[in-house]
Each structure stands twice: as structure tokens, then as C-alpha cells.
Amino acid sequence: MAVTACQGLGFVVSLIGIAGIIAATCMDQWSTQDLYNNPVTAVFNYQGLWRSCVRESSGFTECRGYFTLLGLPAMLQAVRALMIVGIVLGAIGLLVSIFALKCIRIGSMEDSAKANMTLTSGIMFIVSGLCAIAGVSVFANMLVTNFWMSTANMYTGMGGMVQTVQTRYTFGAALFVGWVAGGLTLIGGVMMCIACRGLAPEETNYKAVSYHASGHSVAYKPGGFKASTGFGSNTKNKKIYDGGARTEDEVQSYPSKHDYV
């Protein structure tokens, strides 16, 4: 039951995270005009990965797409790539994890296959989250660098000194959405990897054989007392009278290749 819950929760958290990564990638507010020097501006600028926008005090908003590829900064292209890779990996991870969910029965899929798929999707979510966090962090670093470079300058115009304040940009809402979403996807991926361990198939147990000794009606099951392995094994010496049948909660997991990721 705990495995199913962990897997389900991991899926839901990753789903929310990937939805957030998609939202952040599409958002226009990656960088917003710094209003420190002019808090009552009548023209507000903000920029996204795909277009830049201007919102006027009148309420009129105009957005212009970046219709060039070669003319864009390499860093922006890198951020775009990281976010897209994150989305693609996350989407594939979601698709894989749907089939890996323990609560969903698909034909005669074995637990080992579900465990593999859970691990695969978990790794994909982790990489997806890392891509999003990396992309947002690169963009944030770019903003910080540009912010300090964009200081007000003075130049001499006709008729004396005329001041021009270069527009400075600071962190936009999309950055925070991206960081949180990337973190959620990462957490979801870790949860899927943890759930994978619980899904790993058990060692085959011998079929229980009942020996009816005279005067005693106790079933004897070879292998009924499993040696403690330290990986979720049942340490209580519990005699089993059910001939090997168990509930999902009692299923014990053993070390497998999936535990060492």
C-alpha cells in the first residue's frame, strides 16, 4: 500500500511540476522592468523566452515575438533548449509512469516491468526538473549580470545635459514558477525511484506444503522465516499459515538492481 501511495504521489507531484514547467516556458514574465528608479512608470516592459511585451498605463498591451533565431543571445537559446528538453523528458516520463502505476492493470504486465518503468520515469522526472532549474537559473544569472551593467548614463544633448535611464530588468514571475515547478518535478522523480524499490519482484517462494502430524494441526512452510536483509524485510518471526498467499501490504522487497540508482 505504501509503495502504491508513494508511486501515485510521485506521479501527481511530477504532473504538477511538469505543468508548471510548461506554464513557465510559455509565460511572458521571465524578466520584468525594475521599477526602483521610477515606481510610477506609465510604460511597463516585460520579457519572456519567446516575446517581449509592453503594458501601457492606458491598459493597452503590445507583445512582439522574437522573429529571429540567429540574432538572439546564445544564453537565451540555451535556456529555451533546457526548458524544451525538460518538457519533452517530463512528458515522456508521464506517459511511461501512467503505464507503470501499480493501481493500473495492463494485460499481464509483471511487477518487474512496472518497476523498470517506474525507475525510468523517475529518472526522466529528475532530469526534467534539473533541466528546468538549470534553465531558470541560467536566465536569472543573465539578469543579475545585465542588471548591474545597465546603470544610468549621462550624455550631452543639444541644449545641455539630458538624462536617459536605461531600462533595467529584474526577476519575473516565470522564474519563481520555473524554480518551484522544477523542484516539484525533481521531488516527484525521487519519489518514483523510491517507489520502484518497493515494486521490485520477490524471490520465488516454494509452494507451502501441509504436513498433518498426529496430534498437531500446524502447517509447516519452508522459507517461512526469511533472513533479515535490511531492505524492508519483515523482522518479526511470523509463522505463515496461508500457504504463501499474502496481501499487498505484506509483500516484502529484496535488494535488486533498482536499489542502487
Epitope: 512608470t41 510604460v43 516592459n45 498605463s57 492606458s58 531600462t167
Partner: antibody, heavy 118, light 113 residues
Framework: EVQLLESGGGLVQPGGSLRLSCAAS????????MSWVRQAPGKGLEWVAT????????YYADSVKGRFTISRDNSKNTLYLQMNSLRAEDTAVYYC???????????WGQGTLVTVSS | DIVMTQSPDSLAVSLGERVTMNCKSS????????????LTWYQQKPGQPPKLLIY???TRESGVPDRFSGSGSGTDFTLTISSVQAEDVAVYYC?????????FGQGTKLEIK
């Protein structure tokens, strides 16, 4: 047809109060940022205050800050300017205006005259 | 605050003549986000409210005759009337629409000789 009709002007003593109204019609009032602009007799134009659509952010000229309050009632399609602690230099024709692209004022009312005199 | 200075204060021209009036701002009105200049020109005829002529420094408002044109960028702007008509007698104001407080120039009075 877009129409802006100001009312509420008149003669008031220094230190007195007055409330100007601007009835708007012919457009979706709630979607537009609105402003008040004044013009003293024989003088140039002076921006007074602006109120945005939606969240209703307000902006004021330094000369009226703390004394004038711009507000709007979208249900009544009406813009207001509450003027307190009036001074002689507030004597002017007050125009109600609508903002459009470029923050330009594309429609103006006919104006209402406010005279502050003892 | 951005100070708007218009020149000349007044000018008298003959009908059909080309006229230019200037407006200078103390700070640049060019917005880097959309590369537009937030300067507006208004015409005010005697006894009437002002009328919008040009916004974004060079975009003519609908219904405004094409003899009116705006130009300039940054801090220096010009309003040109290619062929003055009798009905163009008015005071012309430029306005900063870039940052609050919105400020107007003192106006340029156009008269016919």
C-alpha cells in the same frame, strides 16, 4: 458615439470642497484608464490625475497630491474627482479624458469650470 | 519630472505654407521595450477641448488629415503641417506620456498672416 460629460463645477471659497463627476457613454467604461486634465484661464494644459481600469491604480500631479482624489464607479459609468482644501490656483476648466494607445487622451469632455475665490 | 519645452511660442504663416514646430523633453521618451517614443501632440482650437492629433510621436490618430505628421525620437520631436489651412489656427501642445506625472509643453500658437 463616445461621450464624456463633466458636471459639478462652480464657485467655491478657498479651503472648500467640490466633487466633479464625468458621465461616460458610447464605450465600455470599465475597460479604459481615465484622467482629469485642467486648464487655467488663458494658460496651458495641466495633467491632474489618472485612474487605471481594473485594479484602479491612481496617480496624481504633485500640485494636487493629498488634496484631490480620483475614483470611478464602473456600474454607473462615472468618473469622479473629489477636490478638498481648494486654493485660488486650482481655478481652471477641468476636463475628463479617456486614455488610449500610447497613453494618449483620445476623447475629451467639454469641461467644467471650477472657480476658487473668496 | 520630465520638462517639456516647445518652440516657438507662436508663429504666423500664410495659407498653404509648410510649418514645423518643435518639442524638447528633459529625458528621453523612447521606450526600449517596443522602440516607441511616448510623445503625443494635441490641437486646441479657441473655446474647444483639445483634440488628439499624433501619438507614439509619429502615429496619426484616425480622422486626422494627412497634412499633419510627427517625427523625432528620444528628446527632440517635431510636428509638421505640410500645407496650412485656415481651420488649423489653434494652440498645439506636446505631452510626455512616458512617465508620471504626465507633463505638457507650454504650447505653440499658430496664426494665419
Amino acid at each position: 458615439e463616445v461621450q464624456l460629460l463633466e458636471s459639478g463645477g462652480g464657485l467655491v471659497q478657498p479651503g472648500g470642497s467640490l466633487r466633479l463627476s464625468c458621465a461616460a457613454s458610447g464605450f465600455t467604461f470599465s475597460s479604459y484608464t481615465m484622467s482629469w486634465v485642467r486648464q487655467a484661464p488663458g494658460k496651458g494644459l495641466e495633467w491632474v490625475a489618472t485612474i487605471s481600469s481594473g485594479v484602479s491604480y491612481t496617480y496624481y500631479a504633485d500640485s494636487v497630491k493629498g488634496r484631490f482624489t480620483i475614483s470611478r464607479d464602473n456600474s454607473k459609468n462615472t468618473l469622479y474627482l473629489q477636490m478638498n482644501s481648494l486654493r485660488a490656483e486650482d481655478t481652471a476648466v477641468y476636463y475628463c479624458t479617456r486614455l488610449t494607445k500610447g497613453n494618449a487622451m483620445d476623447y475629451w469632455g467639454q469641461g467644467t469650470l471650477v472657480t476658487v475665490s473668496s | 519630472d520630465i520638462v517639456m519645452t516647445q518652440s516657438p511660442d507662436s508663429l504666423a504663416v500664410s495659407l498653404g505654407e509648410r510649418v514645423t514646430m518643435n518639442c524638447k523633453s528633459s529625458q528621453s521618451l523612447l521606450n526600449s521595450g517596443n522602440q516607441k517614443n511616448y510623445l503625443t501632440w494635441y490641437q486646441q482650437k479657441p473655446g474647444q477641448p483639445p483634440k488628439l492629433l499624433i501619438y507614439w510621436a509619429s502615429t496619426r490618430e484616425s480622422g486626422v488629415p494627412d497634412r499633419f505628421s510627427g517625427s523625432g525620437s528620444g528628446t527632440d520631436f517635431t510636428l509638421t503641417i505640410s500645407s496650412v489651412q485656415a481651420e488649423d489656427v489653434a494652440v498645439y501642445y506636446c505631452q510626455n506620456d512616458y512617465s508620471y506625472p504626465f507633463t505638457f509643453g507650454q504650447g505653440t500658437k499658430l496664426e494665419i498672416k
